[in-house]
Amino acid sequence: IVGGQEAPRSKWPWQVSLRVHGPYWMHFCGGSLIHPQWVLTAAHCVGPDVKDLAALRVQLREQHLYYQDQLLPVSRIIVHPQFYTAQIGADIALLELEEPVNVSSHVHTVTLPPASETFPPGMPCWVTGWGDVDNDERLPPPFPLKQVKVPIMENHICDAKYHLGAYTGDDVRIVRDDMLCAGNTRRDSCQGDSGGPLVCKVNGTWLQAGVVSWGEGCAQPNRPGIYTRVTYYLDWIHHYVPKKP
């Protein structure tokens, strides 16, 4: 997370850390708890060549990475069938946990938005994660969860910005309908935040607007962060994840 600050312990109870096996269980992406047994993340975190179940664990909300790990095994990894690369879209995936999480005030699910929600500019939105704090600058120990408030940008404006200095023709969309833009040169998500949630407060409820997906660098001029637009994939999500009763 570029800019922002350490998150208060009481906030973002749906944030999870995805871990890959190595010399230690290393954080490599974020995710969000959308159901006691389901995590939403980015497809590019776990695909297109899907990792072994044995190579992956989920760590629920913790203030500092690695300090109180209780790693959870995953029983299923579901990558959106249309995913190939983040830039093309469909950068969304689901992880089913072997056992449902015991929800509490400290760890619970985030609400998915209604399909009609557009998340217009001006809405109070935040992105969270344990990713880099600047381009090629890692989050330093003790690896606190960070948060930053990011401004939403309309897709057509974001697309125009991404065309500046790019070889892509103006008639070719870079920012697609299944994407959402947020951030500026002082506030952005970065490498290691991928898969984590962009949430916005709507009528007093935190709704997950986006999944950290891609961008050209972090907090670069005319290059806002690009997120998978959750509303675009609600039907796909609910094909697997039970709706709340």
Partner: antibody, heavy 119, light 106 residues
Framework: EVQLVESGGGLVQPGGSLRLSCAAS????????MVWVRQAPGKGLEWVAF????????YYADTMKGRFTISRDNSKNTLYLQMNSLRAEDTAVYYC????????????WGQGTLVTVSS | DIQMTQSPSSLSASVGDRVTITCSAS?????MYWYQQKPGKSPKPWIY???DLASGVPSRFSGSGSGTDFTLTISSLQPEDFATYYC?????????FGQGTKVEIK
């Protein structure tokens, strides 16, 4: 001593049912995913079914789906395999195994129980 | 479903020989697991996560590979190594084993 002891095997007619049990001791049973593996006479190992520590997740080999049911009773430290609509090709030694907590390999095996399906 | 194919199905070797068993997965996996079984006995865990030796396994055993092709190697075959070896993946369900490789005395 960490131990798994299977029981319940025997001779059953085609179409019949059998319930295998596996008694676990020497470890905290409720912390571990458990697996049944079988081996037909003179043949190789075949994965049968998996159950997670709290029973929320179960998976079966395709040929056993709909006929076999894996379950567990953590209060009794016991794993079960209910086998229905048995066929001759289900004849095998059935092993109960513990899945290693960290690395997911099958680190503890029972001695096996022989199931014979024959008329 | 991922299919596992071991080769050879059986081999004859002498004490002191270097022996290599291969396991091929029908699609890419991250890790391979190996088990040893002797006649009339339950299988034992032998190698996990491709190259880590299970407790009590002698250092003459090694595992390697990535993607779809994995190997178990015995650098110098000993009498107690004559057994059948099985590979297994833990990529996704259903889990599958290879058909086994029987290592016999020449």
């Amino acid at each position: 001593e960490v131990q798994l002891v299977e029981s319940g095997g025997g001779l059953v007619q085609p179409g019949g049912s059998l319930r295998l049990s596996c008694a676990a001791s020497g470890f905290t049973f409720s912390d571990y995913g458990m697996v049944w593996v079988r081996q037909a006479p003179g043949k190789g190992l075949e994965w049968v079914a998996f159950i997670s520590s709290g029973s929320s997740t179960v998976y079966y080999a395709d040929t056993m789906k709909g006929r076999f049911t894996i379950s567990r009773d953590n209060s009794k430290n016991t794993l079960y395999l209910q086998m229905n609509s048995l066929r001759a090709e289900d004849t095998a030694v059935y092993y109960c195994t513990r899945r290693n907590y960290d690395d997911l390999y099958f680190d503890v095996w029972g001695q096996g129980t022989l199931v014979t399906v024959s008329s | 479903d991922i299919q596992m194919t071991q080769s050879p199905s059986s081999l004859s070797a002498s004490v002191g020989d270097r022996v290599t068993i291969t396991c091929s997965a029908s699609s890419s996996v991250t890790y391979m697991y190996w088990y040893q079984q002797k006649p009339g006995k339950s299988p034992k865990p032998w190698i996990y996560r491709t190259s880590d030796l299970a407790s009590g396994v002698p250092s003459r055993f090694s595992g390697s590979g990535s993607g779809t092709d994995f190997t178990l190697t015995i650098s110098s075959l000993q009498p107690e190594d004559f057994a059948t070896y099985y590979c297994q993946h833990y990529h996704s369900y259903p889990l599958t084993f290879g058909q086994g490789t029987k290592v016999e005395i020449k």
